[in-house]
């Protein structure tokens, strides 16, 4: 198959009732039959991505290069758009042919590796309606979804899922973690006719729900009654002070004394040093500010609810999953340290297929990635510590050196000379 | 939290430049946008532009560009905003302040306002 | 440009509910951020995001946000909220603020 595939399936009416399986759901038409591969891309035919994907026209953003990078498991499988400019804005995009989810599941996958060691930078995608410029796609840019992982210092390391819904992005309301490693790792967006969602990693889900409750498309479904305020005779005190409680008479004490043992110094001199006091010092009879015993509270009523009301606002909304338009993939990021490596961009409306794919791909070549990033980490390990071998031997041979410069001069003869010589003589 | 202390009152003559910090402690640096915003006596709020210090990348308003340039330096959690070509217009009380960090985007830093203020500089402009 | 129009003055009896607007072509589509900014003071975030409040401000403040209009609702108002409201959005690249509101709390 061509390295990018597109595929667009508007059955017709008779395709539909003799091949389709028909299924009637909250107002919406469900089509169970062939996955519809609406686009695919794994940059499997060389420079042949450059003809796909638009850049847009601006000098100063970053360049893509296809790299299967430092470490892979399949030189040529594992080969994507890498970023390869630090501190740069990316912006890049392909197009297919436009669709509809309505009525269908969306699937959105694509694999992305961080191999730099990603300090700051975007991971995500997004998919646009056919109307985008692609030559200046931004970041303001009108996108339908945003998907994919993001991570920027130590407080940002998130999938973002988010929506446009009536011209506003909307985020979720959960927070669903990425990986920060520098492995290649798959990401996953289910969305479903019944207003359902699903994102996996690694082809496991990480999380799932109900697009209604996971995302504040909607006004709420109860607000606090406007009309409705606390009692004024309400009380919401547990514990009272005892009536019937009363202070001691011989509580009062001072909380300082003066020192009873204390004794004016013999050379104290009224007129110089003024009138002798004698230092303070604590009470031991004094017991603190008097409390009355606590009781319960006989009027408790307990916390105030404010209560709800149905929202005249709400209105529950069945197609919020649902885009008239999908036309483009675009790569819109920023990277403070460039090396991320995307690939395999699958759009489907098949859960199945999508797994399978990522199986395929990511699923393939994952073990030996690993094997290859842990070889050249042992080859590194063992390249330094032969460097801090050869250190300590120059250090060692130094040392030796400096000995015999510092000791004093000694006729260089070997021992078996020395002792032939002493023979001889005597 | 984040607190940002904004260096002291200047007064400068038309034509010149001014430079203010802002330093910020309590927080990590580098996980926050830091935005300049001025406010001319009597009136009202006006965006001069922003720098996300991860980034080094700054960030400026149609309005400032060319005279503003906004830095911010890492190592000691300090931002910079330089106005040059001063003139009395220029009279304002000069503020700083964040916004976390939720993203590699610009738009991220301004999706959740900007929640922490510095004091405030004071720059007079008078011949 | 994007412009954002507030109302120079709203008052309000204490106990009462006021509303400050901000008006915008298809300010529903933006988030929107409302800060309050008491005489000598630096401006305090109250909401962000339309209708989310910051931790330590009261639930008598909420926002909300449609069509070409966003607004910030202050119920039971006090004295102490007598103050300049902004409103502000994020537009093409840029952050923009409202005009400002001068809330007087009567009495």
């Known amino acids: 198959s061509s390295s990018l595939e597109v595929l667009f399936q508007g059955p017709g009416l008779n395709d539909i009732f003799e091949a389709q399986k028909i299924e009637w759901h909250e107002e919406n038409l469900y089509f169970q039959g062939e996955p519809a591969v609406y686009f695919k891309e794994q940059f499997l035919d060389g420079d042949g991505w450059t003809s796909r994907w638009i850049e847009k026209h601006k000098s100063d953003f970053g360049k893509f290069v296809l790299s299967s990078g430092k470490f892979y498991g399949d030189e040529e499988k594992d080969k994507g758009l890498q970023t390869s400019q630090d501190a740069r804005f990316y912006a890049l995009s392909a197009s297919f042919e436009p669709f509809s989810n309505k009525g269908q599941t969306l699937v959105v996958q694509f694999t992305v590796k961080h191999e730099q060691n990603i300090d700051c930078g975007g991971g995500y995608v997004k998919l646009f309606p056919n109307s985008l410029d692609q030559t200046d796609m931004h970041g303001d840019s009108e996108y339908n979804i945003m998907f994919g992982p993001d991570i920027c210092g130590p407080g940002t390391k998130k999938v973002h899922v988010i929506f446009n819904y009536k011209g506003k992005n909307v985020l979720i309301n959960k927070d669903i973690r990425c990986k920060d490693d520098e492995f290649t790792h798959l990401y996953t967006l289910i969305v479903r006719p019944d207003n359902t969602y699903e994102v996996k990693i690694d082809n496991s889900q990480v999380e799932s729900g109900s697009l209604e409750d996971d995302w504040d498309f909607l006004p709420p479904k109860k607000i606090k009654d406007p009309d409705a305020s606390k009692p004024e005779d309400w009380d919401e005190r547990a514990k009272i002070d005892d009536p019937t409680d009363s202070k001691p008479e011989d509580w009062d004490k001072p909380e300082h004394i003066p020192d009873p043992d204390a004794k004016k110094p013999e050379d104290w001199d009224e007129e110089m040093d003024g009138e002798w006091e004698p230092p303070v010092i604590q009470n031991p009879e004094y017991k603190g500010e008097w409390k009355p015993r606590q009781i319960d509270n006989p009027d408790y009523k307990g916390t105030w609810i404010h209560p709800e009301i149905d929202n005249p606002e709400y209105s529950p909304d069945p197609s919020i999953y649902a885009y008239d338009n999908f036309g483009v993939l675009g790569l819109d990021l920023w990277q403070v340290k460039s090396g991320t490596i995307f690939d395999n961009f699958l759009i489907t409306n098949d859960e199945a297929y999508a797994e399978e794919f990522g199986n395929e791909t990511w699923g393939v070549t994952k073990a030996a990635e690993k094997q290859m990033k842990d070889k050249q980490d042992e080859e590194q390990r063992t390249r330094r510590m032969m460097r801090t071998k050869m250190r300590m031997r120059r250090m060692r041979r130094t040392r030796r050196k400096m000995r015999r410069k510092m000791s004093p001069a000694r006729p260089r003869t070997s021992c078996r000379e020395a002792c032939l010589q002493g023979w001889t003589e005597a | 939290e984040v607190q940002l202390v904004q260096s002291g009152a200047e007064v400068k003559k038309p034509g010149s430049s001014v430079k203010v910090s802002c330093k910020a402690s309590?927080?990590?640096?580098?996980?926050?946008?830091i935005s300049w915003v001025r406010q001319a006596p009597g009136q009202g709020l006006e965006w001069m532009g922003g720098?996300?210090?991860?980034?080094?990348?700054?960030n400026y308003a149609q309005k400032f560009q060319g005279r503003v340039t906004i830095t911010a330096d890492e190592s000691t959690s300090t931002a910079y905003m330089e106005l040059s070509s001063l003139r009395s217009e220029d009279t304002a009380v000069y503020y700083c302040?964040?916004?976390?960090?939720?993203?590699?985007?610009?738009?991220?830093?301004?999706?959740?306002?900007?929640?922490?203020w510095g004091q405030g500089t004071t720059v007079t402009v008078s011949s | 440009s994007y412009v954002l129009t507030q109302p120079l003055s709203v008052s309000v009896a204490p106990g009462q509910t006021a509303r400050i607007t901000c008006g915008g072509n298809n300010i529903g589509r933006k988030s929107v951020h409302w800060y309050q900014q008491k005489p000598g003071q630096a401006p305090v975030l109250v909401i962000y995001r339309d209708s989310n409040r910051p931790s330590g401000i009261p639930e008598r403040f909420s926002g909300s946000n449609s069509g070409n209009t966003a607004t910030l609702t202050i119920s039971r108002a006090q004295a102490g909220d007598e103050a300049d409201y902004y409103c502000q959005v994020w537009d093409s690249s840029t952050v923009v603020f409202g005009g400002g509101t001068k809330l007087t709390v009567l009495g």
């Open positions: 720098i996300i210090p991860i980034f080094g990348t700054a």
């Open positions: 302040a964040s916004s976390p960090l939720r993203g590699s985007g610009w738009y991220w830093h301004y999706y959740y306002g900007m929640d922490v």
């Open positions: 309590g927080g990590t640096f580098s996980s926050y946008a």
